[in-house]
Amino acid sequence: FERTRSLQDPCSNCPAGTFCDNNRNQICSPCPPNSFSSAGGQRTCDICRQCKGVFRTRKECSSTSNAECDCTPGFHCLGAGCSMCEQDCKQGQELTKKGCKDCCFGTFNDQKRGICRPWTNCSLDGKSVLVNGTKERDVVCGPSPADLSPGASSVTPPAPAREPGHSPQ
């Protein structure tokens, strides 16, 4: 069937970057400016995406591929192909309907995007809080209270440093 179709349909010979022009006896015409066709045999070219406002051009449109956008500084991409730009907040904040708001007590956000998340509950793992949480940082859990016998150090000494990729002697 494919072979038959290509014999009958001159449009199948039109390469990417062109379209099959019905107004000109199905001649393969180049895509007009600001349009593209990414596959062969197209009867029309698609309009190039325009990166406007907070969207900036990451890759220019060509006759065979669409433009690609990202976001200007202070914003980050959301959605497939950067279909949205969302304003950054500071660490320790989240974007709400009323703008960037500080994380509530007991929550943190260590990024400029996303939502505030609850601090880790160390006691669920039978551990104690070694370092308190902040708006920007999660708590650090330490050994369980039972491990902290009098005189015992509450912090495990670090392992001796070694070069990456080397096994311990």
């Epitope: 995406r49 406002g53 907070v54 969207f55 950067c82 949205m84 974007l95 709400t96 309907k97």
Partner: nanobody, 122 residues
Framework: EVQLVESGGGLVQPGGSLRLSCAAS????????MSWARQAPGKGFEWVSG???????YYTESVKDRFTISRDNAKNTVYLQMNSLKPEDTAVYYC????????????????WGQGTLVTVSS
């Protein structure tokens, strides 16, 4: 064809006022949410304010109680009344459609005006 044309920018002294207008055409304005953004010289964009089709308004913290967004659906125009202007309000102000209805978020299908420059200086 969608068009957004801003006007009303200019030079104003600190503490002064300006009213920006954005005339819209080429789409159903009355059912569209609209927004204002700004870009200070050498800096990134900042979401300033937004207004839903029903009239609910939203502002970024730094302009709250100083700026007022409003709309006139009969004139297909959205306004930004700016009072108590500060030097840090100096920027190019852009009008844009606001299809996401989410604070600080614009989508690729939103339309943008060319901007109007507001300079706050003595």
């Amino acid at each position: 064809e969608v068009q957004l044309v801003e006007s009303g920018g200019g030079l104003v002294q600190p503490g002064g006022s300006l009213r920006l207008s954005c005339a819209a055409s080429g789409f159903t304005f009355s059912s569209s949410a609209m927004s204002w953004a700004r870009q200070a010289p050498g800096k990134g964009f900042e979401w300033v304010s937004g207004i839903y089709s029903g009239g609910s308004t939203y502002y970024t913290e730094s302009v709250k109680d100083r700026f007022t967004i409003s709309r006139d659906n009969a004139k297909n125009t959205v306004y930004l009344q700016m009072n108590s202007l500060k030097p840090e309000d100096t920027a190019v102000y852009y009008c844009a459609t606001w299809g996401t209805l989410r604070f600080g978020v614009w989508a690729e299908y939103d339309h943008w005006g060319q901007g109007t420059l507001v300079t706050v200086s003595s």
